[in-house]
């Protein structure tokens, strides 16, 4: 376990071999989750890229947060996708949080502390527990089958995950840098493996 506070993973160039694999102590399927993270890239007006890829053997797109060029954020649960459009692209560090719950299917998507309109996805579904969680690449199969054209070039950090839906107040607290206790992925006690050309550097966001 490593305390990654104030640090970020840096992916300096396009590749299909560089990634970070995150280890999560999940023992049972997820009926809800929240993922929050920071990232910083110049790619958004150039091409799509993977932000967070959670694959199981049953479904390579179990959870996927992806930037789709000319559209915005693509969010997939269990292979089914919804979009959160972004009309104008700026180059700046971004903080996102997204949550989903099986009981209602409701998805929340927050960008820099601001919520997008709630949407619905995969009501009644459960997310598999035996997962390969990858930063920097999009998994087309469990733990692999990467394409350079979908890789992240830039920085990613503060990746935290919970097995429940955070309240708006809790998400606001996280965005403002307040205290929180993630129970699936914890950036302050991170288990991870680096493959390829990935560097750990001080974070560039406040």
């Amino acid at each position: 376990q490593t305390d990654m506070s104030r640090k970020a993973f840096v992916f300096p160039k396009e590749s299909d071999t560089s990634y970070v694999s995150l280890k999560a102590p999940l023992t049972k399927p997820l009926k809800a989750f929240t993922v929050c993270l920071h990232f910083y890239t110049e790619l958004s007006s150039t091409r799509g890229y993977s932000i967070f890829s959670y694959a199981t053997k049953r479904q390579d797109n179990e959870i996927l947060i992806f930037w789709s060029k000319d559209i915005g954020y693509s969010f997939t649960v269990g292979g089914s996708e919804i979009l959160f459009e972004v009309p104008e692209v700026t180059v700046a560090p971004v903080h996102i949080c997204t949550s989903w719950e099986s009981a209602s299917g409701i998805v929340e998507f927050w960008v820099d502390g601001k919520p997008r309109v709630r949407k619905s996805l995969k009501k009644g579904y459960t997310v598999g527990a035996e997962a390969s969680i990858i930063l920097g690449q999009e998994q087309d199969s469990f733990g692999g089958n990467f394409e350079g054209s979908q890789s992240l070039v830039g920085d990613i950090g503060n990746v935290n995950m919970w097995d429940f839906v955070l309240s708006p107040d809790e998400i606001n607290t996280i965005y403002l840098g307040g205290p929180f206790s993630p129970n699936v992925l914890n950036w302050r006690a991170l288990k991870y493996e680096v493959q390829g050309e990935v560097f750990t550097k001080p974070q560039l966001w406040p």
């Epitope: 797109n61 789709s68 693509s74 292979g79 996708e81 919804i82 979009l83 949407k119």
Partner: nanobody, 117 residues
Framework: EVQLQQSGPELVKPGASVRMSCKAS????????IHWVKQSHGESLEWIGF????????YYYKNFKGKATLTFNRSSSTAYMDLRSLTSEDSAVYYC??????????WGQGTTLTVSS
């Protein structure tokens, strides 16, 4: 076995409208989005849009807003695309595909549309 079966070729006059279909089988229809793609002769693929049969969401790429209308029927596991105000520029092969904006794993065989007077 997953299959996407598309309707047959269409020959229509300029200014008319057309509907083409894509019948899905071999999986739960509401589990995946259905995308529609245009391939003009000798040109690269153009993404038209997609429909999410689970929640009813539709998304249209810029060039096809107002040109295409995407619908579906859950009970028959069929997706439809209507194209309006047709011109010769709309002559192409149109494909449906299952998947996401990131990746599409199964494709229909294509429907050829010819717009000619």
């Amino acid at each position: 076995e997953v299959q996407l079966q598309q309707s047959g070729p269409e020959l229509v006059k300029p200014g008319a409208s057309v509907r083409m279909s894509c019948k899905a089988s071999g999986y739960t229809f509401t589990d995946y989005n259905i995308h529609w793609v245009k391939q003009s002769h000798g040109e690269s693929l153009e993404w038209i849009g997609f429909v999410n049969p689970d929640n009813g969401d539709t998304y249209y790429y810029k060039n096809f807003k107002g040109k295409a209308t995407l619908t579906f029927n859950r009970s028959s596991s069929t997706a439809y695309m209507d194209l309006r105000s047709l011109t010769s520029e709309d002559s192409a092969v149109y494909y449906c595909a299952r998947g996401t904006t990131v990746e599409k794993d199964y494709w229909g065989q294509g429907t050829t549309l010819t717009v000619s007077s």
